[in-house]
């Protein structure tokens, strides 16, 4: 007769592992035992458990509760043993010796593999602005048994980096995204994407990028020269930005205060039925916690009795 | 052969302990597992727990959690500790070991001792 065994058996951790041992004997044989042990290198035996045909199954003290028989039908010839709830501790090689009648002893030893699935965590790194150069957008960290592999999944430029940790039954595996922050990064999906034979499907962690910046500042309103003029009605002038984090904006005048009437509405300014006394230079101030820019515009309220034309300058200044 | 001689036996009240012990002689040079029968009047012998010569064990349900089976392979002597004994405990109690042979091969002949007498009453 022989045995019938595996090389290698895969479990996942926490769950449980059929370690099989099977004797494929002659006609009129018989299984007596079948006694399972844990037989690393330079650490002996040590008997996990022990199957026999008028006793019953035995399970040492260490494995209380963890070691079963598979459920019926059992063939008599068939020493498999359950190790229930696989934990990384029990990875090692494990030995069947089966004392059959008439043939006596025969012995084969598997390798039992427990894959431990990694629980991979996304760190950002620090805040990205606009103007910086190489910068760390996030890391990715994932822990298992073997090594996890660990990618990343995105549309935005950058350079990846990694770095592995051995412990003593796994490795952690470290990844790195670095990136040249621009605006047009804002909002874009970086995922980490974590790769294992321990897990059914790739574990994917996304992390939504934030750049700070601030847009150069205009002002819009002062198109149509001829719309400025004494009367009119809802002439208003509108102060053009934008940014991360959103920017607040603010009117003043540079030379005096901003006239009774005049309305600010965050980047709007308001005017009621336009006077002379609305002819100034205007400034729009734009500020976020990134940056700020000014924007000012010449206002030259045009009295239609008067032939003279509308003069308008518009400046930026950042 | 193997000889075997249960000690330890005798009168309990119920929720009372005993501990019963057998020593084996003879050709011991391969005793494999080793353990303990009952037979109560007028019923089958049934297991009550056994243990290998590695330690790994086997209980009965019906005594699981009361009773500990321990054994000294240096003296090849095999111990059942009983504890909260029940009136349903009193049974002749039966030391059983068998051998591993050359190469391995498991005897067919399990020994028996003599037995000794457990009786839980009030």
């Known amino acids: 007769g022989e045995l019938e065994t595996s090389d290698v058996v895969t479990v996942v951790l926490g769950q449980d592992a059929k370690l099989p041992c099977f004797y494929r004997g002659d006609s009129g044989e018989q299984v007596g035992q079948v006694a399972w042990a844990r037989v690393d290198a330079g650490e002996g035996a040590q008997e996990l458990a022990l199957l026999h045909s008028k006793y019953g199954l035995h399970v040492s003290p260490a494995y209380e509760g963890r070691v079963e028989q598979p459920p019926p039908p059992r063939n008599p010839l068939d020493g498999s043993v359950l190790l229930r709830n696989a934990v990384q501790a029990d990875e090692g090689e494990y030995e069947c010796r089966v004392s059959t009648f008439p043939a006596g002893s025969f012995q084969a030893r598997l390798r039992l593999r427990v894959l431990v699935p990694p629980l991979p965590s996304l760190n950002p790194g620090p805040a990205l602005e606009e103007g910086q150069g190489l910068t760390l957008a996030a890391s990715c960290t994932a822990e298992g048994s073997p090594a996890p592999s660990v990618t990343w999944d995105t549309e935005v430029k950058g350079t990846t980096s990694s770095r592995s940790f051995k412990h003593s039954r796994s490795a952690a595996v470290t990844s790195e995204f670095h990136l040249v922050p621009s605006r047009s990064m804002n909002g874009q999906p970086l995922t980490c994407v974590v790769s294992h034979p321990g897990l059914l499907q790739d574990q994917r962690i996304t992390h939504i990028l934030h750049v700070s910046f601030l847009a150069e500042a205009s002002v819009r309103g002062l198109e149509d020269q001829n719309l400025w003029h004494i009367g009119r009605e809802g002439a208003m002038l509108k102060c053009l930005s934008e940014g991360q984090p959103p920017p607040s904006y603010n009117w003043t005048r540079l030379d005096g205060p901003l006239p009774s009437g005049v309305r600010v509405d965050g980047d709007t300014l308001g005017f009621p039925p336009l006077t002379t006394e609305h002819s100034g230079i205007y400034v729009c101030h734009v500020s976020n916690e990134f940056s700020s820019r000014d924007s000012q515009v010449t206002v030259d309220v045009l009295d239609p009795q008067e032939d003279s034309g509308k003069q308008v300058d518009l400046v930026s200044a950042s | 052969q193997v000889q075997l001689v249960e000690s330890g036996g005798g009168l309990v009240q119920p929720g009372g302990s005993l501990r019963l012990s057998c020593a084996a002689s003879g050709s011991i040079f391969s005793i494999n597992v080793m353990g303990w029968y009952r037979q109560a009047p007028g019923k089958q012998r049934e297991l009550v727990a056994t243990?290998?010569?590695?330690?790994?064990?086997n209980y009965a349900d019906s005594v699981k959690g009361r009773f500990t089976i321990s054994r000294d392979n240096a003296n090849n002597t095999v111990y059942l500790q009983m504890n909260t004994l029940k009136p349903e405990d009193t049974a002749v109690y039966y030391c059983?070991?068998?051998?591993?042979?050359?190469?391995?091969?498991?005897?067919?002949?399990?020994?028996w001792g003599q037995g000794t007498l457990v009786t839980v009453s009030s």
């Open positions: 243990i290998t010569s590695g330690g790994s064990v």
């Open positions: 059983t070991a068998d051998q591993l042979g050359p190469l391995g091969l498991l005897s067919p002949t399990i020994y």
